[in-house]
């Protein structure tokens, strides 16, 4: 557990007359209809807000939006609809704001049905003013930005055309028809998938992969027999056609699709999938699905090339393409993910992993916690959490886990406590050392939010009743002080504080309900106020990372490095600050065994770190290798875990061994690619 | 054949506890769990808990927490529940009954409900002062 | 917590006749829901589970119907035996709940 002061609550003072000072009311001039809000930037306070509400009448549906504008984090908005013209907002589309700091913002606007095509309005000043801009084409998708060039705009039509623009979307161009799926890729490139025949649907499993690096001037096939494809840290994976049935494969490339290697592993067939869990640089996390409707699959993980695989999780829960998991990247810890399994008897079980996929075990029991009825005993069991499949169960869970990159080992949760996740009404739980120890933090379902870096957090009561009381804690959950931010309760819809956790605003977002009326309000409130001062040195302490033995010379080593932090301590109350940087010192490992997977045609004997080579490749898939342009396989049987750091220690040495004769040939082969110029 | 036999008729005074037994024979006691429902004069059923024969852990109702505890014996195959702080509302009768399907949420082949397909005959508890 | 509503509270029928009640869960219990019988003086006794499903021992006149919120009992033909109360009751979200239960009485 992260380090803290064992001591009663003591109550922050004058708080309530600090955040009543602090509190702002704003009544939105509309009817109840839906609400949608974005923030425009990073630390510029301007939040825009759509409000639409859809009136039916007996022929159509019309629609009315309106535009409010921020710049003080909500305190205060501006109605901007005339901005827009008074147009009707086409919400399924979002509003569209660009990377970064570029202070972009594009609206697509709902158009009359005769008309040539769409129309957006675009913003390049954080939303001070909009251009209108009538679209030679019906947008199908919203407006997608290139990661690397804000200007740089692209977007499929309803007509399955890919259109782009590269000057924010004042002048478009279609670059190519028969589009099925278009992502941007690294260095403005494109990737895009086409049908030759029919059209999407009935071309799966015989698209091409098409990539352009120079915005549709030319074009290259990069894969043929293609059923779908993705993007993934440095990794460009599509799912290809076997030539003989109905079965796909997963191929790799980390050139943009020059060259192709088949990835090692489980081909699937008509009714099953693959998935991208999460991606980086080093490595991937990928699903796949089991045969038949069972819901679950495999998580295999990835060795740097994205071409051999380790099994990691057996009956992941997964339910359809496209559907529920609870897969969930514990972003306050290095190497933390937490997910859900489907047992024997149906009932579903959460993991954990602290070494990025290598090992995966339950979650400790919280010591301030029973177990449940899910419990075969009263003293042993687990903590489960609720994430995407509970809340798509409509079990009560209102928000699914929570954790920030800049509040250091924070993770907050709902959860029961037993041998699997119960039906019964969830507690809320929070880690303070990244998923290691856990403890009740609320009673009840609730809607959580990490401020200031971790030095507020902020907690609402779900409730079918009007509210008016907000919670916040300032010692990591350990102490709870209530606000009523408001004599007249409102019906809660939602808790928005700015991405990132830096902000010190919270914005409770809901509706009043009056005998013949019904309108939005939000209460902004800032508490600057309550941490009155700066963090200084004596407020933080030194805290080693995945430390679970201090006796052992190697704790806290976690993939070939163990990091000690600066952390808040729990006692202060101070503010972190908008400016505050995570604070590490790394220091390097010796290498151990843990730190290698087993390379193609090797394998670890169960209860074994040493890996040992496969007696012969009979038996086994022989498309499970290399392809693309290798000659030969050289592998010692060991590769290093991606982004282990280690040095020293262990050095597993094996004779390299020629396997290149075992292969047969790749699906997506140079020979089969061919280019083109517009 | 299956039956729970429940413990005879108790009078209590306002703020004591009452503690009822179940005594389950005719099935693995071990393998089904057991609910307590209860039921004032003139009123509907109330659902109060369930107990994990096995491992003897609880889920109680959220208007019964705090004050209701379940327990069970292997031993005598029995479970027992005792409400405490009694009030004059908690006059009832008090039934335990087989609950097989527990408590655990489902994967997608969907969680089925058996329903509490064996009662016992139930046990009146009158609070008076 | 959910809330199950029976209606009518009362129904009035003559033996023979068809009785069909009715129950309905403020939420989706999807098919988590079962009907019991209560006769005075005795402890309620399963009917129906799963919705649909009848329990070991309940005659073919007793049928439960529905998925979601809306729920039905129907008892085909009424017997003497029959008339008594009836309880739904919904095992998807804790904490178990009873509806207020319909009295079938002799008309």
């Known amino acids: 557990s992260a380090p803290g002061e064992d001591e009663e609550c003591g109550r922050v003072r004058d708080f309530v007359a600090k955040l009543a000072n602090n509190t702002h009311q704003h009544v939105f001039d509309d009817l109840r209809g839906s609400v949608s809000l974005s923030w425009v930037g990073d630390s510029t306070g301007v939040i825009l807000v759509l409000t639409t509400f859809h009136v039916p009448l007996v022929i159509m549906t019309f629609g009315q939006s309106k535009l409010y504008r921020s710049e003080d984090y909500g305190k205060n908005f501006k109605d901007i609809t005339d901005l827009i013209n008074n147009t009707f907002i086409r919400t399924e589309f979002g509003m569209a704001i660009g990377p970064e700091n570029s202070g972009k913002v594009v609206l697509t606007a709902e158009v009359s049905g005769g008309s040539r095509g769409g129309r957006i309005f675009r913003s390049s000043d954080f939303a001070k003013n909009f251009v209108q801009t009538d679209l030679p084409f019906h947008p199908l998708t919203q407006m997608m930005y290139s990661p690397q060039n804000s200007d740089y705009l692209l977007a499929l039509s309803t007509e399955n055309g890919l259109w782009v623009s590269k000057n924010f979307g004042g002048k478009w161009e279609e670059i190519h028809k028969a589009v099925c799926l278009a992502k941007w890729g690294s260095d403005n490139t494109i990737f895009f998938t086409t049908y030759a025949n029919g059209s999407c649907k009935a071309d799966l499993g015989a698209l091409e992969l098409w990539r352009t690096s120079d915005l549709g001037k030319s074009f290259k096939t990069i894969g043929v027999k293609i059923y779908s494809f993705g993007l993934g840290g440095r990794f460009l994976f599509a799912s290809v056609m076997a030539d003989k049935d109905t079965t796909r494969r997963i191929h790799v490339s980390t050139d943009q699709g020059d060259t192709w290697s088949m990835a090692q592993l489980p081909s699937v067939g008509q009714e099953q999938f693959y998935s991208i869990l999460a991606a980086n640089d080093d490595m991937v996390f990928m699903h796949v699905d089991e045969p038949g409707d069972t819901g679950f699959g495999t998580i295999f993980t990835s060795d740097d090339r994205g071409i051999v695989y380790s099994k990691s999780l057996d009956r992941h829960l997964y339910t359809t393409t496209g559907g529920e998991t609870d897969f969930t990247n514990v972003t306050s810890l290095r190497g933390v993910y937490i997910t859900s399994v489907l047992s024997e008897d149906n009932s579903i079980q959460t993991m954990i992993t602290f070494d990025q996929g290598g090992r995966w075990t339950h979650l400790r029991k919280p010591e301030n916690s029973e177990c449940d009825a899910t419990a075969k005993n009263k003293n042993e069991c687990s903590l489960h959490i609720h994430a995407s499949y509970s809340i798509s169960q409509k079990l009560n869970v209102p928000m699914a886990p929570l954790s920030e990159p800049n509040a250091v080992g924070i993770v907050i949760a709902h959860g029961s406590v037993g041998d699997a996740i119960s039906v019964m009404v969830p507690d809320v739980y929070i880690s303070d050392d990244g998923g290691y120890s856990w403890t009740k933090m609320l009673e009840g379902p609730h809607y959580y939010t990490i401020l200031d870096s971790g030095g507020i957090i902020v907690a609402i009561e779900h409730s079918s009743r009007p509210i008016n009381v907000i919670k916040f804690s300032t010692d990591e959950g350990q102490c709870w002080q209530t606000y009523t931010f408001t004599r007249d309760p409102i019906y809660f819809t939602g808790l928005a504080s700015e991405p990132g956790a830096r902000s010190m605003n919270i914005s409770i977002w809901g509706f009043t309900e009056s005998f013949l009326t019904s309108q939005w309000v939000s209460y902004t409130i800032d508490f600057k106020d309550i941490l009155e001062r700066n963090c200084e040195e004596k407020d933080y302490t030194i805290w080693l990372a995945h430390s679970t033995d201090p006796e052992d010379y190697e704790d806290g080593c976690i993939l070939g490095y163990k990091e000690q932090f600066l952390r808040l301590r729990k006692s202060s109350v101070c503010q972190n600050g908008r400016d505050y940087v995570v604070t590490k010192q790394p220091s390097i490992c010796l290498c151990s065994l843990e730190d290698f997977l087993c390379d193609f045609g090797y394998y670890r004997p169960e209860n074994d770190s040493k890996c040992v080579e496969q007696p012969e490749l009979k038996g086994h898939d022989l498309e499970f290798c290399l392809y693309g342009r290798e000659e030969h396989l050289t592998t010692n049987g060991y590769r290093k875990i991606p982004g282990d750091k280690c040095q020293g220690g262990v050095n597993p040495v094996r004779e390299v061994k020629d396997l290149k004769k075992k292969c047969t040939s790749n699906f997506l082969s140079p020979e089969k690619q061919n280019s083109k110029s517009n | 054949q299956v039956q729970l036999v429940q413990s005879g008729a108790e009078v209590k005074k306002p703020g004591a506890s009452v503690k009822v037994s179940c005594k389950a024979s005719g099935y693995t006691f071990t393998s089904q769990y057991m609910s307590w429902v209860r039921q004032a004069p003139g009123q509907g059923l109330e659902w109060m808990g369930i107990?994990?024969?096995?491992?003897?852990?609880?889920s109680y109702a959220q208007k019964f927490q705090g004050r209701v505890t379940m327990t069970r014996d292997t031993s005598t195959s029995t479970v027992y529940m005792e409400l405490s702080s009694l009030r004059s509302e908690d006059t009832a009768v008090y039934y335990c009954?087989?609950?097989?399907?527990?408590?655990?949420?489902?994967?997608?082949?969907?969680?089925?409900?058996?329903?509490?397909?064996?009662w016992g005959q139930g046990t009146t508890v009158t609070v008076s002062s | 917590e959910i809330v199950m509503t029976q209606s009518p509270a009362t129904l009035s029928v003559s033996p023979g006749e068809r009785a069909t009640l009715s129950c309905r869960a403020s939420?989706?219990?999807?098919?988590?829901l079962a009907w019991y019988q209560q006769k005075p003086g005795q402890a309620p006794r399963l009917l129906i589970y799963?919705?649909?499903t009848r329990a070991t021992g309940i005659p073919a006149r007793f049928s439960g119907s529905g998925s979601g919120t809306e729920f039905t009992l129907t008892i085909s033909s009424l017997q003497s035996e029959d008339f008594a109360v009836y309880y739904c009751?919904?095992?998807?979200?804790?904490?178990?709940?009873f509806g207020g239960g319909t009295k079938v009485e002799i008309k």
């Open positions: 799963g919705a649909s």
């Open positions: 009751q919904q095992a998807r979200l804790g904490p178990w709940t």
């Open positions: 939420q989706s219990v999807s098919s988590n």
């Open positions: 107990i994990n024969p096995y491992g003897g852990s609880t």
């Open positions: 009954a087989r609950d097989p399907s527990g408590i655990a949420a489902a994967g997608p082949a969907s969680r089925y409900y058996y329903g509490m397909d064996v």
